[in-house]
Interface confidence: low
């Protein structure tokens, strides 16, 4: 049959080469002469020429030694053709398997491995894992099967077999008790990897095992008793530094101290922190101490480590006697901020309130008072009694000094201690409104057309508070009601000004009297600019031109006639009608009305 079973060839063969491996044979050679050839990687494609075939006999030849670690299997095709080149067989698969020889030593993945384990651990505790590789085959042979072992241990204390290594996994474990960091902080193991599962080639590496500190020593206070002096009221004040000694590894969790106030701090006045470098306990005041309440505190402080103890250890305790030193304390206003209601505009010299301070010190110290900040200069304070009186007119409506009806004053109290101390208090005067302001309109200048005029709405404001404000009442005075009307809206907070008679283009004074709900009256003059226009206007347009704007000499003559007529009529009116001087503009306006009639006729 045109079939070849897989061919096994050992790597690293010694030859001689070419070496006959197997013969390809087609049964078609009875009928005709057959020529044999091979193709594929290792024959006619890279790596070319490793294999060849005798053309006429069909012998498969190996031309050179093979390397399994380079190519473990070759897949070739055998071909059979007749003399005329025609294929007599289908291409045949030829598998050549390269069998392994133990031609590689194991290699560790690192020259030096590093691991760590806590001191005092029990046998069986895993430390670390090491790894070696071997390029040889470990599936069909033992050539690449690595076995691990410990060749040596340094130092050999407490004895030379402190560690073991798992033969196949490379896991290093503790095999004996007695690991003591204080005695041996680090072991160096020379480890071996041997192929053939321990019977072949060997290579070595180093495994360093660091012995980590376990918390087998308690921190101890040295000394155990302290006395300290602290001024009263000091917050964040360093009271005392407590010193401890610990035999564990410096700066490790087993060495770093954790302090706890076990007793004597009922009011939670103290706190203790660990200095990160010196490991001292820094006792400080969290709150101010009060000499008058308690002049001595006895604290009991316990020290442990950040890391838990690995065995039962006694904890060390220190005693700190804290003496509180008296200081002259500042007087304290009662209350610190005092709210007083007072009517605005009270007479000068009238009392406002009494505002006094208390001294926390036990001695009966004399307290004197003065005003520290009085922006408007409205008040005075009796230095002995703390009596506050008005020396100026309190004005609720003074926006420079009064905010939200409140006038703020800062007062000072000083004791006669040595040295004297001062305390401040805040006096908040809530000024009660009186009806001392009348209503005023806004705006006070208006512009209005003299034909189909638009009503002018003016807002009414009053600096006082309710009920001294709206509803407001409006009244026109000084004959302003001849040409104008003033009406207050339903809400009573705006006034509507209307022109009820024709006025010529000019500026007029409208005399308006407004009164509030408390009948406080305020007279205001509204400056009204009347324009020759219809309806709404912002500013007056150009001079009035009557008729259809026709010009020329005719128009000029009419203008002269109108002026003469106005002058005559004006003279008559002045003589006949006796009016106040300030009504002159309104009188001219009447004459203008007559002039308008002339114009309309002319038109």
């Amino acid at each position: 049959d045109w079939v070849v079973a897989p061919i096994s060839v050992p790597e690293n063969g010694k030859g001689p080469f070419p070496q006959r491996l197997n013969q390809l044979k087609s049964n078609k050679d009875r009928d005709t002469k057959i020529f044999y050839s091979i193709t594929g990687p290792g024959a006619d494609s890279p790596p070319e020429g490793v294999f060849a075939v005798e053309k006429e006999t069909g012998w498969l030849l190996l031309n050179k030694p093979l390397d399994r670690e380079e190519i473990a299997k070759y897949e070739l095709f055998g071909h059979a053709v007749s003399e005329n080149g025609a294929s007599v067989e289908d291409p045949m698969n030829i598998s050549i398997i390269v069998t392994d020889q133990n031609d590689h030593k194991p290699k560790f993945t690192q020259d030096t491995f590093r691991g760590s384990v806590l001191e005092g651990v029990l046998p069986g505790t895993s430390v670390m894992q090491v790894t070696a590789t071997d390029e040889d085959d470990a599936i069909y042979t033992y050539n690449g099967v690595v076995a691990y072992s410990i060749h040596s241990q340094e130092p050999k204390e407490p004895h030379d077999l402190m560690f073991t290594i798992h033969k196949s996994t490379g896991t290093i474990s503790v095999i004996s008790s007695g690991l003591d960091r204080e005695k041996v902080p680090e072991y160096t193991l020379t480890i071996q990897a041997t192929d053939m599962d321990g019977d072949g080639s060997t290579t070595t590496a180093v495994a360093v095992v660091e012995i980590l500190d376990a918390n087998d020593n308690a921190p101890m206070f040295d000394p155990q008793k302290y006395e300290a002096h602290v001024p009263e009221n000091a917050v964040g004040h360093e009271v005392q530094r407590l010193t401890v000694t610990d035999l564990d590894a410096p700066n490790s969790p087993a060495w770093r101290a954790t302090y706890l106030i076990m007793g004597g701090d009922d009011g939670d006045h103290f706190t203790i922190t660990t200095h990160p470098e010196s490991n001292q306990g820094i006792l400080t005041t969290r709150k101010g101490l009060d000499f008058e309440a308690k002049n001595q505190h006895t604290l009991y402080v316990e020290v442990t480590n950040e890391a838990p103890f690995v065995l039962k250890l006694p904890t060390s305790t220190a005693t700190i006697v804290v003496h509180v030193e008296d200081v002259n304390e500042a007087p304290v206003f009662v209350p610190p901020s005092k709210v007083v209601e007072v009517q605005e505009g009270i007479p000068t010299g009238e009392p406002v309130c009494v505002y006094t301070a208390e001294d926390p010190d036990k001695e009966n110290q004399k307290i004197s008072y003065r005003i520290l900040r009085d922006p408007a200069g409205w008040l005075a304070m009796d230095p002995d009694s703390g009596q506050v009186t008005a020396v100026g007119t309190l004005d609720r409506e003074d926006e420079q000094f009064v905010r939200n009806n409140i006038y703020e004053v800062m007062v000072l109290a000083m004791d006669n201690g040595s040295p004297p101390t001062t305390g401040t208090g805040t006096l908040l005067l809530t000024l009660i409104d009186v009806n001392d302001h009348g209503p005023v309109p806004e705006p006070r200048q208006i512009t209005i057309c003299n034909q189909s005029p638009v009503r002018q709405v003016l807002n009414i404001t009053d600096k006082d508070l309710s009920p001294h404000t709206s509803p407001f009442q409006a009244q026109l005075t000084d004959d302003s009601d001849i040409y104008w009307t003033a009406e207050v809206n339903e809400e009573g907070d705006t006034v509507v000004l209307s022109l009820k008679k024709f006025l010529k283009q000019d500026t007029y004074d409208v005399h308006l009297s407004l009164s509030d709900h408390g009948n406080k009256e305020q007279l205001t003059v509204i400056r009204a600019t009347v324009c020759d226009c219809h309806g709404h206007v912002e500013t007056c347009p150009g001079p009035w031109k009557g008729g259809s704007g026709g010009g020329g000499s005719g128009a000029g003559v009419i203008a002269v006639i109108v002026v003469v007529v106005i002058a005559i009529v004006a003279g008559i009116v002045v003589l006949v009608i006796s009016r106040k001087k300030r009504m002159a503009k309104y009188e001219k306006a009447e004459i203008k009305e007559m002039g308008e009639m002339h114009r309309e006729l002319n038109a």
Partner: antibody, heavy 123, light 113 residues
Amino acid sequence: VQLVEESGPGLVAPSQSLSITCTVSGFSLTSYPINWVRQPPGKGLEWLGVIWTGGGTNYDSALKSRLTISKDNSKSQVFLKMNSLQTDDTARYYCARSRGAYDFDGRGAMDYWGQGTTVTVSS
Amino acid sequence: ELVMTQSPSSLAVSVGEKVTMSCKSSQSLLYSSNQKNYLAWYQQKPGQSPKLLIYWASTRESGVPDRFTGSGSGTDFTLTISSVKAEDLAVYYCQQYYSYPYTFGGGTKLEIK
């Protein structure tokens, strides 16, 4: 690795106490410290305290007098108890695992956090 | 207690931009014995728990994208995001674990334009 906070009622009356349980899985409380951190609404984070692998504790000094942290290693549970609650204790309370038990682990950094439980203090 | 101050309190950047935020401590966080800075950075996305990004001031926590970098020493620290992504919208907090109590900064809110 998972941390789950379970609390009693989310609403606590002023002056009453608060208890929260943090149940962990995927690691042992004998290997990792557990921290408690809170976050008032719309504000930043505030560390409350820690319980070490051996059961030791450290507290924020301002809260020490009314805060207790304890644990049950066998049940993988850590407990926070806070007394005398006031309105400014209203916050989301988180438990968070330290990176490791030793300094060289960066123990003060917290690598796994619970989802937090909201506590409202109101009358 | 040790005070941590973060700046700015908020900032808005476009996707792809580089962003830096600062954290200052009231005392040095560098421990001379091991030359490590006891500082961590966290990210808190809206409605989520904080997530550890950086510890020892510059060591990236496993699984954290390498666009996040922590730097600085002593009292001045910086978190840098080399190229901001939309998913980085969060508040970033620094935290010291040099001394008790552990304290956090007020946070920097990162908004995406």
